[in-house]
């Protein structure tokens, strides 16, 4: 009983004056609270609370469920308590089967006893199964049995409170422990796409997936450098115990250019935070940008192959692509493919394969591409390098020797005189006249060069060589001279092609 100090308010006194009282089932409970400022009696057991404004608490026929703590409170807020056990051999436990434990914390199995004098008050596994080896508990007859430091592995553990009564083990109703996980890692966050490219007015929708051990993980979409609350929609899943997933979908129904920017999906729990970003670019209209992968001026040798390659960015997706030469569209010999299989890819490659090009196939090759918004084109100027070909080699009526050669690049014509029967013509002869015949035309075909020398300069038998050459190769034509007296006999031209 409390000691009384004069002048200070004192707690109420209770009769009978003991901390615990044991009564048998069916007996009377009579508790008297003595205090000039009596306010109420309160009864508590498990989650149940009852009040009584009478200073004497009387229960005529006690039941096991009357087991609990009886507290008398006065007007000063001071109180005193007595715990009553109502011994009922048929009901040794009062139970609240709801059993939740937070990982790494203690949790109470609420099975208070109605008889404090039973022995071996403990926990047992259901159906004779042993409890986990590391499970520690502390029994308290008035409250239940406290499981210390709950482990995640105890989730869904089935157990009973147990006592020994007259040498026999008595079990309570079963309890199923539900463990609430502690956060021991940051949430896992991912985003449906890392970047989005849209035209004005199109819908922007992006989904963030947040994974954690429980639904109490926090998540939100944020716009970088902005405090505006974004509109999100959610879905959630429990993929079994300790495996929770939330999807947060952010939508802008009609995106504008100024919506462009970086959006962050942020998630945190008591352990830490994680985030992932996605970039939105909104353009007022679509575009196509073409990048040649080779020089747009191409030189290729006669009979060789060349690939004309472009990369291009197209948004929205390209709808029509074509390669054109001399107003004709290629139906084959070309391929067009996306640069990557990535869903957000906007870069494409187009290749035109030109094989065994002839000298007549030089010219402008044009790649055209279009989408729903724009058209674009790029031109390649292809020059076919050809070895000179001597078209004519004649003695003109005015006594001139004339050589006409065609090739690309423009051939150079040199003249040589070989006296007598020598095979090597080393003495060079300067031409009288050199003309490029078709330089005014398109610069893709062969260039024709005409060169003339005066045959009157030759006084001896011999051979005159006309040699046409360029970067690709050389070709020669020969004029034979024979003198009879002072007269030149016929000139016999013949050619010798030198590779």
């Amino acid at each position: 009983q409390p000691s009384v100090s004069p002048g200070e308010p004192s707690p109420p006194s209770i009769h009978p004056g003991k901390s615990d009282l044991i009564v048998r089932v069916g007996d009377e409970i009579r508790l008297l609270c003595t205090d000039p400022g009596f306010v109420k009696w309160t009864f508590e057991i498990l989650d149940e609370t009852n009040e009584n404004k009478q200073n004497e608490w009387i229960t005529e026929k006690a039941e096991a469920t009357n087991t609990g703590k009886y507290t008398c409170t006065n007007k000063h807020g001071l109180s005193n308590s007595i715990y009553v056990f109502v011994r009922d051999p048929a009901k040794l436990f009062l139970v609240d089967r709801s059993l939740y434990g937070k990982e790494d914390n203690d949790t109470l199995v609420r099975c208070p006893l109605t008889d404090p004098e039973v022995t071996n008050y403990s926990l047992k596994g259901c159906q004779g199964k042993p409890l986990p080896k590391d499970l520690r508990f502390i029994p308290d007859p008035k409250a239940g049995i406290m499981i210390k430091s709950v482990k995640r592995a105890y989730h869904r553990l089935c157990l009973h409170c147990s006592v020994d009564q007259e040498g026999k083990s008595v079990l309570s109703e079963k309890f199923i422990l539900k463990v609430r996980p502690a956060f021991k890692a940051v949430p896992v966050v991912s985003v449906s796409k890392a970047s989005y490219l849209l035209r004005e007015g199109e819908e922007f929708t992006v989904t963030c997936t947040i994974k954690d051990v429980s639904s109490s993980v926090y998540s939100t979409w944020k716009r970088e450098n902005s405090q505006t609350k974004l509109q999100e929609k959610y879905n959630s899943w429990h993929h079994g115990d300790f495996n929770y997933e939330r999807q947060a979908t952010l939508t802008i129904s009609s995106a504008r250019v100024n919506d462009s920017g970086v959006f962050m999906c942020y998630a945190n729990n008591t352990f830490g935070s994680a985030n992932v970003t996605t970039t939105l670019e909104v353009v007022d209209k679509g575009f196509i940008n073409i990048f040649p992968m080779i020089n747009t001026t191409v030189f290729v040798n006669d009979g060789e192959n060349v690939d004309l390659i472009v990369e291009y960015e197209a948004f929205p997706k390209p709808e029509h692509q074509q390669w054109i030469y001399m107003n004709r569209t290629f139906t084959d010999k070309w391929e067009d493919y996306p640069k990557s299989e990535n869903e957000s890819n906007i870069r494409y490659v187009s290749e035109l394969h030109l094989t065994r090009l002839k000298g007549t196939e030089g010219g402008t090759y044009t790649f055209l591409v279009s989408n729903s918004d724009v058209n674009a084109a790029i031109a390649f100027n292809v020059y076919v390098n050809t070895k000179p070909e001597i078209l004519t080699y004649d003695r003109l009526v005015n006594g001139m020797l004339q050589c006409v050669a065609a090739g690309f690049p423009e051939p150079t014509i040199d003249w040589y005189f070989c006296p007598g029967t020598e095979q090597r013509c080393s003495a060079s002869v300067l031409p009288v006249d050199v003309q490029t015949l078709n330089s005014s035309g398109p610069p893709f075909g062969k260039l024709v060069v005409q060169s003339s020398i005066d045959s009157s300069a030759f006084k001896h038998n011999g051979t005159v060589e006309c040699k046409a050459y360029n970067d690709v190769g050389k070709t020669s034509a020969y004029f034979n001279f024979a003198f009879k007296g002072n007269n030149k006999e016929q000139i016999h031209p013949h050619t010798l092609f030198t590779p």
Epitope: N235, S236, H238
Partner: antibody, heavy 119, light 107 residues
Amino acid sequence: EVQLLESGGGLVQPGGSLRLSCAASGFTLTSYAMSWVRQAPGKGLEWVSTISGSGGYTYYADSVKGRFTISRDNSKNTLYLQMNSLRAEDTAVYYCARDSGYDRGLDYWGQGTLVTVSS
Amino acid sequence: DIQMTQSPSSLSASVGDRVTITCRASQNIYTYLNWYQQKPGKAPKLLIYDASSLHSGVPSRFSGSGSGTDFTLTISSLQPEDFATYYCQQSSSTPYTFGGGTKVEIK
């Protein structure tokens, strides 16, 4: 004692709007997720929407997505359901219910309020 | 969305009978299953949560079992006040869905 009291039901024309309220007492609204569940005349229960304890997360049935908005005013301990673009098939008794937490089911329900959508 | 199928849709039984109602989910919902009782003109009441846990204040004649896709509500000895409609509901993933209900009538 936990109590939930719905109000705001009534007759509304198709395409119209209505706001249902659910006044909660006996517990703190912020500690619990709250849901709306409806029951068409003579039919079974249909989950409509749930809002988390913080109010940060809202979930909707496909049939009401984009038309209904769940919200809460924790200072007034009140849950709301704003219903727009109402259709005849939205006619039902609407119940608000408390989620007992940790996905343990809806442990307390209001008495329901009838919404009739008809021209 | 997860579909919940209850069977039977109705049954007739007598006081004292053992009654079993089943609920099947269209995909794995682990133990995220709740059972409710509803009487005409009244709001539903939670009986069982987490497939097998008895809600406080619910008589112990009600029990639940199952996990994954197949679940059972059992009333061990039917009492007069148990004649009602029973619904299962999954809380594994949104949208949360109810079964079609089972009406328990007096034989």
